[in-house]
């Protein structure tokens, strides 16, 4: 018996071939011997089966001795043995229809779980293997679960259902709703304007929700809400903003915040959350601000950084075009009695300068100049 696998909602064509290459009488029946369709001369006739409005054949092939049964918009319950009677012969074809669906919406928040459920006919014992867009393979039976979805899981999932050494492939498009970056860090000299950007990693027609930026300054004992906003059809409107600092927010996507001045008291970490309409859970992006200050007080030239720096970063003070006078894994370094000239304070990671501040040291009888 020939086995054919079909996909729910698709069209399948079951073949039936006579030895005579001409139009002769044929009938297609199901396992209950109920006629589905056949011919009367050159006319297509249909029986009382439940497939009535979804069954068809190709009259153009009858003259070649081919009498296919076409079933449109397949349902799981269409799984059956179909019998083609032609020339006193009976050809049996077993049709097995499978369906694969995502448990919920195919737009899921980062960190949520994706469950794929296989619908299969009674008596079948299929195996399923799915390949994610990033090439990760998962296997299972009737259900497959992927916990903690990541941004790289966005895209087309290809799932193969295997039954009786035959396979059928399903493609499911999954959109993981997330920010492009889970975390970002901004390095600024004291007094510079700070730009925070929160680009989304997905595009949808309408985007509605609300968001908030909570900030934990390094110098503060507790975090505070810096700004709250609404999002309506990709338009941003500020609901509430603190007086210090007075953040500005762009009116269009991507979400964009401006801090007029980088100051040591603002250095720290923030968490921007975005709650989307009709979605449980929130999108998160962490943002960090590191602020540098170079100062000269009497005979002491000091360079300091505030904010979440890593213990691998090196802070250095050097006279322009000379070797570093001091280079340490600290958040503050200083030089006593610095020579006159342009001094550079450098925060670097494996030789790559992340932040630089210059300060001009004048001969001892004059005051320092900050360029």
């Amino acid at each position: 018996k020939k086995v054919v696998l079909g996909k729910k909602g698709d069209t399948v064509e079951l073949t039936c071939t006579a030895s005579q290459k001409k139009s002769i009488q044929f009938h297609w029946k199901n396992s209950n011997q109920i006629k589905i369709l056949g011919n009367q001369g050159s006319f297509l006739t249909k029986g009382p089966s439940k497939l009535n409005d979804r069954a068809d054949s190709r009259r153009s092939l009858w003259d070649q001795g081919n009498f296919p049964l076409i079933i449109k918009n397949l349902k799981i319950e269409d799984s059956d043995t179909y019998i083609c009677e032609v020339e006193d012969q009976k050809e049996e074809v077993q049709l097995l229809v499978f369906g694969l669906t995502a448990n919920s919406d195919t737009h899921l928040l980062q960190g949520q779980s994706l469950t794929l459920t296989l619908e299969s006919p009674p008596g079948s014992s299929p195996s399923v293997q799915c390949r994610s867009p990033r090439g990760k393979n998962i296997q299972g039976g009737k259900t497959l679960s992927v916990s903690q979805l990541e941004l790289q899981d966005s895209g087309t999932w290809t799932c193969t259902v295997l039954q009786n050494q035959k396979k059928v492939e399903f493609k499911i498009d999954i959109v993981v709703l997330a920010f492009q970056k889970a975390s970002s860090i901004v390095y600024k000299k004291e007094g510079e304007q700070v730009e925070f950007s929160f680009p989304l990693a997905f595009t949808v027609e309408k985007l509605t929700g609300s968001g908030e930026l909570w900030w934990q300054a390094e110098r503060a004992s507790s975090s505070k809400s810096w700004i709250t906003f609404d999002l309506k059809n990709k338009e941003v409107s500020v609901k509430r903003v603190t007086q210090d600092p007075k953040l500005q927010m762009g009116k269009k996507l991507p979400l964009h915040l401006t801090l007029p001045q980088a100051l040591p008291q603002y250095a720290g970490s923030g968490n921007l959350t975005l709650a989307l309409e009709a979605k449980t859970g929130k999108l998160h992006q962490e943002v960090n601000l590191v602020v540098m200050r170079a100062t000269q007080l009497q005979k002491n030239l000091t360079c300091e950084v505030w904010g979440p720096t890593s213990p691998k970063l090196m802070l250095s003070l050097k006279l322009e075009n000379k070797e570093a006078k001091v280079s340490k894994r600290e958040k503050a370094v200083w030089v006593l009695n610095p020579e006159a000239g342009m001094w550079q304070c450098l925060l670097s990671d494996s030789g790559q300068v992340l932040l630089e501040s210059n300060i001009k040291v004048l001969p001892t009888w004059s005051t320092p100049v900050q360029p």
Epitope: T309, P311, K312, S316, K328, A332, S350, G351
Partner: antibody, heavy 121, light 113 residues
Amino acid sequence: QVQLVQSGAEVKKPGSSVKVSCKASGGTFSSYGISWVRQAPGQGLEWMGWINPNSGGTKYAQKFQGRVTITADESTSTAYMELSSLRSEDTAVYYCARGEAGNLDWYFDLWGRGTLVTVSS
Amino acid sequence: DIVMTQSPDSLAVSLGERATINCKSSQTVFSTSYNKNYLAWYQQKPGQPPKLLIYWASTRESGVPDRFSGSGSGTDFTLTISSLQAEDVAVYYCQQYYSTPLTFGGGTKVEIK
């Protein structure tokens, strides 16, 4: 498993130059920096400098400034250390080493087997 | 530059006994900003490159036997081999990575008595 494979032993005349190579096999070369450390016979370890293949940035110990040049070829995952104006006291085993997690000015979790450079007239 | 001084220069210890190596830095290698000691210990056997044993002054590198331990803070550090084995015969070096240039101690040779 990443390995650092160094070039063979060299015998050089005083005043000449030597170029030692260090090839990274089995890993992404650009994701970590390479430092050079030397060891004179029966002596301790001496850091010479490093290269960051990502940026091409280099840093040299003051003692070797002007005499040492560290380069890298990303296409072959190879770092090079060239020491010029050789003198007898440069006779040493020259090691390339990787800073843990790609960090430079760090501790070294992976070393090459060393290249003996002998400077003799 | 930070100068690293090791003592003793050499040490002879009976098998199964404790071996203690000291390392002193000319300036602190403890970062008050990050609350870490930027000090590593290496083992070097004849004809071989150094092998990392300890970093952050007391964190054992994976695969290193637990008879090796590091302690100390600021300027004074110790490497202890709790029960010396034959395969521990080597030269041991300390290294600071708090400040550039990176500097190593002169080494301590450990032998069996």
